[in-house]
């Protein structure tokens, strides 16, 4: 997070975050004094959740849209303190970072793997994703590979477009400082690849989660 | 009980369009990759195409590249191959195979086949 | 493509005899090679994957072994319902591709 500034925006929760933090000021109001095996608590929490039918979901899926209005009405005035550009604060209207051949293959072969062992984690449902694209050849990866280039592609192109309308007055400027930055952009954007698609990953297996229990 | 049944086999004309499907049973149909083979008659067996469980990619063999279209319909767990400007050499017994997918270090296996429908093209 | 070459193209054997089958491929294809067992008028069934593991339901006299170019279907002890023709299949590349067969026969 911001490095401890005060004046930054608490981050949005999830419907399932809001349920956590209910069930855990239930537990604290029936026993003031225990103290909470986490692990034990959290897995409590995710069966319970799983079992919740989408009414009973609903009012944490309501407080979770109301978080995420406040969460986005908060950042548009907030101003990160100087050098902080680390998790800056995503435009909702921005071109969506395209998904990795890696990431591709997982939406195919998720349901299964989480179909076939229902009691799996997230992190081993990701890791038995993870062998079993270690386990295809290199010729069955070709066309997440080929579809995962044709949307950076897009995205690229798509970014561009993005950055030049966000930035009418861009042009006058020097193509020598554009230059320049563009290095230190992709580095940023690199790392935030990565981020973006952790974040991908478990939102869409939280999607998961709440449409097998609509089924 | 797993199981594939092909039909829409027949005898159709050179340049002729034809159209397989596969019904599955017995298993999650959406969570395999899955695969047409054919056999002409006395011969060895041929991949034909094969497509993912989302539908989204599909991959063929040369030989019928431009001519053939796998699709599947996950919500009546039906596969189908529909096949246009049949050639001579196009006759043969058409299986519809489920595909195991990265199990191993092995890659893929066609673990369950249908019984086959016959297709000959002649005039 | 790559090719997969088999032989004997047919053998001919009695029951109870130890029978191999060897499957060649153009290139390597490290352990992801497959058996299949055909009858006559029936779909093929598979037998072995991944070069060495025994589908289940698969009678444990059936075997596999190899890696790279070189594989091998070993049957330990023949059975009168193993009179069929065998294929084996790469799944390194695509195509797919199989071996023109080895028709077992009783002798």
């Known amino acids: 997070m911001g490095k401890g500034d005060p004046k930054k925006p608490r981050g949005k929760m999830s419907s399932y975050a809001f349920f956590v933090q209910t069930c855990r000021e239930e537990h604290k109001k029936k026993h003031p004094d225990a103290s909470v095996n986490f692990s034990e608590f959290s897995k409590k929490c995710s069966e319970r959740w799983k079992t919740m039918s989408a009414k009973e979901k609903g009012k944490f899926e309501d407080m979770a849209k109301a978080d995420k209005a406040r969460y986005e009405r908060e950042m548009k005035t907030y101003i990160p303190p100087k050098g902080e550009t680390k998790k800056k604060f995503k435009d909702p209207n921005a071109p969506k970072r395209p998904p990795s051949a890696f990431f591709l293959f997982c939406s195919e072969y998720r349901p299964k793997i989480k179909g076939e062992h229902p009691g799996l984690s997230i992190g081993d449902v990701a890791k038995k994703l993870g062998e079993m694209w270690n386990n295809t050849a290199a010729d069955d990866k070709q066309p997440y590979e080929k579809k995962a280039a044709k949307l950076k592609e897009k995205y690229e192109k798509d970014i561009a477009a993005y950055r030049a309308k966000g930035k009418p007055d861009a042009a006058k400027k020097g193509v020598v400082k554009a230059e320049k930055s563009k290095k230190k952009k992709e580095e940023e954007d690199d790392e935030e690849d990565e981020e973006d698609e952790e974040e991908e990953e478990e939102e869409e297996d939280e999607d998961e989660e709440e449409d097998d229990d609509d089924e | 009980e797993v199981q594939l049944l092909e039909s829409g086999g027949g005898l159709v004309q050179p340049g002729g369009s034809l159209r397989l499907s596969c019904a599955a049973s017995g298993f999650t149909f959406s969570w395999y990759d899955m695969s047409w083979v054919r056999q002409a008659p006395g011969k060895g067996l041929e991949w034909v195409s094969r497509i993912s469980p989302s539908g989204g990619y599909t991959m063929y063999a040369d030989s019928v590249k431009g001519r053939f279209t796998i699709s599947r319909d996950n919500s009546k767990n039906t596969l189908y191959l529909q096949m246009n400007s049949l050639r001579a050499e196009d006759t043969a017994v058409y299986y519809c195979?489920?595909?195991?997918?990265?199990?191993?270090?092995?890659?893929?296996?066609?673990?369950?086949w249908g019984q086959g429908t016959m297709v000959t093209v002649s005039s | 493509d790559i090719q997969m070459t088999q032989s004997p193209s047919s053998l001919s054997a009695s029951v109870g005899d130890r029978v191999t089958i060897t499957c060649r491929a153009s290139q390597s294809i490290s352990s992801y090679l497959n058996w299949y067992q055909q009858k006559p008028g029936k779909a093929p069934k598979l037998l072995i994957y991944?070069?060495?593991s025994l589908q289940s339901g698969v009678p444990s006299r059936f075997s596999g072994s190899g890696s790279g170019t070189d594989f091998t279907l070993t049957i330990s002890s023949l059975q009168p319902e193993d009179f069929a023709t065998y294929y084996c299949q790469q799944s390194y590349s695509t195509p797919r591709t199989f071996g023109q067969g080895t028709k077992v026969e009783i002798k």
């Open positions: 195979a489920r595909l195991e997918v990265g199990a191993t270090s092995g890659g893929t296996a066609f673990d369950i």
């Open positions: 991944a070069a060495s």
